[in-house]
Interface confidence: low
């Protein structure tokens, strides 16, 4: 038997017996040039909802370094450089997969983990709650 | 690379060819509630740099479904609803880890792959090149 795939030869993760442990080759195939996000673009500085990038490091995780965005302002920056508090800077979050060492400190054994990271910020119109 | 601690209860991995292949438990530990990004927030609609979410599906990849953001406008939406082309809507991109089946169709064997995905859009001041 085999854990049944959704496509010839591929497991279906919706079934409870999707193989719990698989072999993963850590020779990363990179479909794009990996760069420090600070160097990849200067959007974090030029945005109307600018953000700072904070380094989050965890040796028990792969990748061990993740950059987290923190919006600089509650409001959004106007053309004149002042902050408009009628608008809101909000983080854009994404769920990403990381590998977590399990048991701890073991180099060859990992568990897949989903974590929520803030990638950058965007400027949104606030939701106004009208009081009756 | 991965920081490799010494621990007597773990396989030896001190040699130069730190195991290219590791065991990964696919019982995902979720540190947050997994949701369809369209439901997680309505920022994509309320942003001054709104975006659409496109479903990217690949059965040879885990996760097989990834949502890609595409900015709706070249410019940014003003308070009056018109687009300001003196500003630019740009995608915020992030490198994420995915598992790629290798060899293809094999249920138990994967390679780690980095791919660049657009998570959302932000409004930036354009870089103006002054012509002498």
């Amino acid at each position: 038997g085999i854990a049944i795939p959704r496509n010839s030869g591929c497991p279906n993760s919706e079934d409870k017996n999707f193989p719990r442990t698989v072999m993963v080759n850590l020779n990363i195939h990179n479909r794009n040039t990996s760069t420090n996000p600070k160097r990849s673009s200067d959007y974090y500085n030029r945005s109307t909802s600018p953000w700072n990038l904070h380094r989050n490091e965890d040796p028990e995780r792969y990748p061990s370094v993740i950059w987290e965005a923190k919006c600089r302002h509650l409001g959004c920056v106007k053309a004149d450089g002042n902050v408009d508090y009628h608008m809101n800077s909000v983080p854009i979050q994404q769920e990403i997969l990381v590998l977590r060492r399990e048991p701890r400190h073991c180099p060859n054994s990992f568990r897949l983990e989903k974590i929520l990271v803030s990638v950058g910020c965007t400027c949104v119109t606030p939701i106004v709650h009208h009081v009756a | 690379g991965i920081a490799i601690p010494r621990n007597s209860g773990c396989p030896n991995s001190e040699d130069k060819n730190f195991p290219r292949t590791v065991m990964v438990n696919l019982n995902i530990h979720n540190r947050n509630t997994s949701t369809n990004p369209k439901r997680s927030s309505d920022y994509y609609n309320r942003s001054t740099s709104p975006w659409n979410l496109h479903r990217n599906e690949d059965p040879e990849r885990y996760p097989s479904v990834i949502w890609e953001a595409k900015c709706r406008h070249l410019g940014c939406v003003k308070a009056d609803g018109n687009v300001d082309y003196h500003m630019n809507s740009v995608p915020i991109q992030q490198e994420i880890l995915v598992l790629r089946r290798e060899p293809r169709h094999c249920p138990n064997s994967f390679r780690l792959e980095k791919i660049l995905v657009s998570v959302g859009c932000t409004c930036v001041t354009p870089i103006v090149h002054h012509v002498a």
Partner: antibody, heavy 119, light 107 residues
């Protein structure tokens, strides 16, 4: 105790149909993928078809594609194999088998039911 | 499709003998191989999974080894109840395929 009991086998003419059933007990049927495997008289084992826990994913050997349909009823703890357009070469003992929880082959098999296709 | 070739197709051995059966895959299947034992008129019984892991309840005289394309089932000291036919099966990818079987007979 895990038990898989097949039924529905018998003699059928070429071109005819038959429906095999497999009654499961002693485990949470809905948590396991299930398969059918057959064995022609005096021959080796041949995989026939697989079905996922939710019935969303189904695989069949090329030799039976378009003729045999695997299905399951989790409420009834039952696995089925609908066999149409039967041929002489389909004559075999048909086993229902449980896929191990982690997908490592078949950990339990039924006793089998004999299907004979002959004119 | 992945072809599984077992050898020998049959062998004669005595109680107490060490018996080795080999199975070769036409392409690499990592460690995704199972071994089954089948006695006449009976259903197959699972012995080994993941090439070398012993199914619970199976005597320790049975062992499996190998990865990639070449695999071995070893019975360290053949017992009277071990006379049967043995099959290997790959579950690396669909379609699932079995070896042709090895019949272990009494010498």
């Amino acid at each position: 105790e895990v038990q898989l009991v097949e039924s529905g086998g018998g003699l059928v003419h070429p071109g005819g149909s038959l429906r095999l059933s497999c009654a499961a007990s002693g485990f949470t049927f809905s948590s396991f993928n299930m398969d059918w495997v057959r064995q022609a008289p005096g021959k080796g084992l041949e995989w026939v078809s697989s079905i996922s826990t939710t019935s969303r994913i189904i695989y069949s050997a090329d030799s039976v594609k378009g003729r045999f349909t695997i299905s399951r009823d989790n409420a009834r703890n039952s696995l089925y194999l609908q066999m149409n357009s039967l041929r002489d070469e389909d004559t075999a003992v048909y086993y229902c088998a449980r896929v191990s929880y982690y997908g490592h082959g078949f950990d339990y098999w039924g006793q089998g039911t004999l299907v004979t296709v002959s004119s | 499709d992945i072809q599984m070739t077992q050898s020998p197709s049959s062998l004669s051995a005595s109680v107490g003998d060490r018996v080795t059966i080999t199975c070769r895959a036409s392409q690499g299947i990592s460690s995704w191989l199972a071994w089954y034992q089948q006695k006449p008129e009976k259903a197959p019984k699972s012995l080994i999974y993941a090439a070398s892991s012993l199914q619970s309840g199976v005597p320790s005289r049975f062992s499996g080894s190998g990865s990639g394309t070449d695999f071995t089932l070893t019975i360290s000291s053949l017992q009277p109840e071990d006379f049967a036919t043995y099959y290997c099966q790959q579950y690396n990818s669909y379609p699932l395929t079995f070896g042709g079987g090895t019949k272990v007979e009494i010498k």
